[in-house]
């Protein structure tokens, strides 16, 4: 009588996360009687995934009917997959004993490699804003993919980006790897509209990458241009003062009016007008009673944007000649961090 | 340590009805076939019914001389085994031995004490 | 039905020497290769106790002087060499086939 033998005639098996893993094996013999035990791993610290005999493995199922006479064939299906069962499956015959089963011999064993797909990439932007010529840093995650070898690429408005680090973790063997990059995006004026992409490729995704994206206007503060100009009215002591707010982002913008330094009117931008790039612009005026003055009338348009020091355009309106345009800028205060627009 | 326990046994009339039961423990009991085995003077040792696992549909066989009056019956949550036996005659005295089947193949490892039914008027 | 029967229906055998005891089925007990026959040992007031499985397999725990062979319908057992502890009834069984049947028995007495 030959001596029973243990057959896992796959060496090797992978099977995608959520999916069921059948890991064959067959006997050449009945003899000795003994249950069919299956383990993960080898050694003193193996787990125990079946036990033909004794306990409940609701996850296992047989693929034969082992109650069959003669029955041969212990292959086992485990359900519902996920990276945490890779490993190395043997399928070990026992002998029984009294009172415990006694290791008779053990098949050559089976590698399940778990093919887990990425996590949809979450790209995320700098915590404040930023004007534009500054340098900013994006970063793309993805969770949870195995095996570890994975694609990771930037694109700003579909231009691939090159400034970028990438890092899959751990470095060593793991069920399962996460990837973290760090990309670095110049801004410029014209950046309310774009997008920045991280896109990953992974075997688990058949050529179809998932993509993460973030909007530029989430992080790009475009700081207004004023323009102060007078306009004679019907009215020879009335002068009409406008003042241009221009190609700014985001929309929340703080205007006020001085006359010779002190507050006329402050109001809040509404009604704005987008222009084709994203920005806005916005138009204020004054009715400046001319006769009310005996001297000359320095006109202010002082901006505040998005929570930034203000930005103030003058305008010196002459009371004794003709009304003529004349004008003088302060210069803009420091970019600060912006709030969120109205 | 595995160990089956009968009860149920006693003195009955003909075409009386008695319940055998039998407490499984120190093995997992929903794994096996579960058998009852009868032993008299006069037949010696005889089969009598079988009832397989949740697997094959808690299927059952019985001894020709039983069927139609034994109920061989089975609840996994309580590791019992039952033996139902209705119409009773003279003949079904002896002892009845709960067996667990080992390898699903009438491999009889595990046999309990055994109860007595003695059927006479 | 497969009918089993057992010969003789009780041997004397001196202690040290071998019993042999024979169980013929009245049908092939045999697929594929196994043989299905399996030997029990019986004790007064005692239930049985499996001694060979599949015709020729020694059950764990039992002493390797037992041993079982034969194929289709003629099978032995043998007692080699036989000990005091071993004056007991002996019954084949079989399941090749429901339903399962017994022989009736062979009483072995120690001399």
């Known amino acids: 009588e030959e001596e029973l033998q243990v057959i896992q005639p796959d060496k090797s098996i992978s099977v995608a996360a959520g999916e069921s893993a059948t890991l064959h094996c067959t006997v050449t013999s009945l003899i000795p009687v003994g249950p069919i035990q299956w383990f993960r791993g080898a050694g003193p610290g193996r787990e125990l995934i079946y036990n033909q005999k004794e306990g409940h493995f609701p996850r296992v199922t047989t693929v034969s009917d082992l109650t069959k006479r003669n029955n041969m064939d212990f292959s086992i299906r485990i359900s519902n997959i996920t990276p945490a069962d890779a490993g190395t499956y043997y399928c070990v015959k026992f002998r029984k004993g009294s009172p415990d089963h006694v290791e008779f011999k053990s098949g050559a064993g089976t590698e399940l490699s778990v093919r887990a797909k990425p996590s949809a990439p979450v790209v995320s932007g700098p915590a404040a804003r930023a004007t534009p010529q500054h340098t900013v840093s994006f970063t793309c995650e993805s969770h949870g993919f195995s095996p570890r070898d994975i694609t990771l690429k930037w694109f700003k408005n579909g231009n691939e980006l090159s400034d970028f680090q990438t890092n899959v973790d751990p470095a060593g063997d793991s069920v399962s790897y996460s990837i973290h990059s760090t990309a670095k995006v110049v801004l410029t004026r014209e950046d309310v509209h774009s997008q920045v992409i991280c896109e990953v490729a992974h075997v688990t995704l058949q050529g179809d990458p998932l993509r993460g994206t973030a909007n530029l206007s989430e992080t790009i503060r475009v700081p207004p241009t004023l323009e102060v100009t007078q306009q004679p009215v019907r009215a020879e002591n009335q002068v009409n003062v406008t003042c241009q707010v221009r190609k700014f982002y985001p929309q929340r913008l703080q205007l006020t009016w001085l006359e010779n330094g002190n507050v006329s009117r402050t109001e809040t931008a509404s009604t704005l007008t987008e222009n084709k790039d994203g920005t806005y612009n916005w138009m204020s005026w004054l009715l400046v009673n001319v006769s009310a003055h005996r001297d000359d009338v320095k006109l202010t348009c002082q901006v505040e944007h998005d929570g930034q020091p203000a930005v103030s355009k003058s305008h010196d309106l002459k009371v004794s000649a003709h009304p003529k345009e004349q004008g003088s800028n302060t210069a803009p205060g420091p970019a600060l961090a912006s709030a969120a627009p109205l | 340590e595995v160990k089956l326990e009968e009860s149920g046994g006693g003195l009955m009339q003909p075409g009386g009805s008695m319940k055998l039961s039998c407490v499984a423990s120190?093995?997992?009991?929903?794994?096996?076939?579960m058998n009852w085995v009868r032993q008299s003077p006069e037949k010696g040792l005889e089969w009598v019914a079988e009832?397989?696992?949740?697997?094959?549909?808690?299927?059952?066989h019985y001894a020709e001389s039983v069927k139609g009056r034994f109920t061989i019956s089975r609840d996994d949550s309580k590791s019992s085994v039952y033996l139902q036996m209705n119409n009773l005659r003279a003949e079904d005295t002896g002892i009845y031995y709960c067996?667990?089947?080992?390898?699903?193949?009438?491999?009889?490892?595990?046999w309990g004490q055994g109860t007595t039914l003695t059927v006479s008027s | 039905d497969i009918v089993l029967t057992q010969s003789p229906a009780s041997l004397a055998v001196s202690l040290g020497q071998r019993a042999t005891i024979s169980c013929r089925a009245s049908?092939?007990?045999?697929?594929?290769?196994?043989?299905?026959m399996y030997w029990y040992q019986q004790k007064p007031g005692q239930p049985p106790k499996l001694l060979i499985y599949?015709?020729?397999n020694l059950e764990s725990g039992v002493p390797a002087r037992f041993s079982g062979s034969g194929s289709g319908t003629d099978f032995t057992l043998n007692i080699h060499p036989v000990e005091e502890e071993d004056a007991a009834t002996y019954y084949c069984?079989?399941?090749?086939?429901?339903?399962?049947?017994f022989g009736g028995g062979t009483k072995l007495e120690i001399k």
């Open positions: 049908k092939s007990v045999s697929t594929s290769g196994y043989n299905y």
């Open positions: 120190g093995f997992t009991f929903s794994n096996y076939w």
């Open positions: 069984q079989h399941s090749g086939e429901l339903p399962y049947t």
């Open positions: 009832i397989r696992l949740k697997s094959n549909n808690y299927a059952t």
């Open positions: 067996i667990r089947d080992y390898d699903y193949d009438a491999y009889f490892d595990y």
């Open positions: 599949l015709a020729s």
